[in-house]
């Protein structure tokens, strides 16, 4: 039969950051190719990455249709050179992925400090609102748009001359912190989804930005809210 020399995929793994979502698997193909299918629990299977020799498949376009849904994927193995019209009725070997719920499981990407501005003894720090591939009404949504108040940011800040860190938290993308006049400070931020209880609860820390450098003086404007 046409599938006797093919081996089923294994180690199916979801790799997802800010909803950019790729399914990876093994083994590297020898004389075989793969096709991936994805569905929601109640939906129909949709085929992607037809007869690919790769061991990964970008499923972002499918999962962003509803990031709160739970998805299942499966990888079929076919002999190299296989074409749809061979007429074989034998089902090729396949392996199921773990279930994947993007909203709960996508990793938070490393955030970026967009700007900081000092006014007297206060510094306003703005976190860049990253764009995702999630859409609503043909408009791409930012990370804040998707997660809303489920997403908070933690700011770590310290005097350039010392190592003692202070923290602040915010439900928006902005901080307003008290600083000592005449002192330079350094900043780093981290994205957090407090309601998660898993390892993907926090992002890695942003690159450190320090006062006295260009970014703080650029007066870039972020996605500003009306504050009270």
């Amino acid at each position: 039969s046409g599938t006797t020399n093919t081996v089923a995929a294994y180690n199916l793994t979801w790799k997802s950051t800010n909803f950019k979502t790729i399914l990876e698997w093994e083994p590297k193909p020898i004389n075989q190719v793969y096709t991936v299918q994805i569905s929601t629990k109640s939906g129909d299977w949709k085929s992607k990455c037809f007869y690919t020799a790769d061991t990964e498949c970008d499923l972002t376009d499918e999962i962003v249709k509803d990031v709160k849904q739970t998805y299942l994927a499966r990888v079929f193995s076919y002999p190299a050179g296989h074409v749809e019209s061979t007429g074989s009725t034998e089902e090729p070997p396949y392996e199921n992925s773990p279930e994947f719920t993007p909203y709960l499981e996508t990793n938070l990407g490393q955030p970026t400090i967009q700007s900081f501005e000092q006014v007297g003894t206060k510094v306003n720090v703005t976190v860049q609102d990253e764009w995702t591939l999630v859409r609503r009404n043909d408009t791409f949504l930012s990370l804040r748009d998707v997660f809303g108040k489920d997403l908070i940011y933690t700011l770590y800040y310290w005097k350039s001359s010392s190592s003692g860190k202070k923290t602040a938290k915010t439900n928006t993308n902005e901080f307003l912190i008290d600083v000592d006049k005449g002192e330079n400070y350094c900043f780093s931020v981290q994205a957090v989804i407090p309601s998660r209880r898993t390892a993907n609860r926090k992002s890695t820390d942003s690159p450190v930005e320090c006062m006295g450098h260009e970014k703080g003086e650029s007066r870039e404007t972020g996605h500003h809210h009306h504050h009270h």
Epitope: L141, R144, T170, L176, D178, H226
Partner: antibody, heavy 125, light 108 residues
Amino acid sequence: QVQLQESGPGLVKPSQTLSLTCTVSGGSISSGQYWSWIRQHPGKGLEWIGEIYYSGSTRYNPSLKSRVTISVDTSKNQFSLKLSSVTAADTAVYYCARDAPYYYGGGYYYYMDVWGKGTTVTVSS
Amino acid sequence: EIVLTQSPGTLSLSPGERATLSCRASQSVSSSYLAWYQQKPGQAPRLLIYGASSRATGIPDRFSGSGSGTDFTLTISRLEPEDFAVYYCQQVGVVPYTFGGGTKVEIK
């Protein structure tokens, strides 16, 4: 000055769907705030139903989640509540409210600072 | 869910007296997420205090909030006639957001 006004039928039959709309005036629904529904049973305390961001991101009270849908229409500057399979226990005054960011302790946190006057919904056949 | 228990249920006081209202949470609540509201009959609630201790815009300084963790207090230093109402505490840190059962401050 932002003002909120609830509208919808005051009487709903059991097992039907309660539908209310909140119209925002004096400000944009897309201005970085959240929009909530809260209800108050006769002579009782307040119960948070859920909230929505202009992007459509929602959070619901788990006790009502299976029956609740909150949606937003930015073009009309409105947000809406649908509560399905209602019973007499859903009889209450329904309020819509704005959730706006206030500065506290170095960051910004959201509080319900503007409320509609409330609309009474009675579930009865 | 976080249960907020307010006490006393009713407080009977005279104008000019001091009112102390308590709100106890079933688990720790960050001060950043604790608010107090005032509600008069036939009206919607009004935000008084946010962040456990910050007064909302237009709220007189006779209203003050304090506390942390699981114990929070709203104090009205000298009751004015317009202060007789029901007061609710609320936490907005954990879904579902919850309100306390309310304390009614009535004229003695």
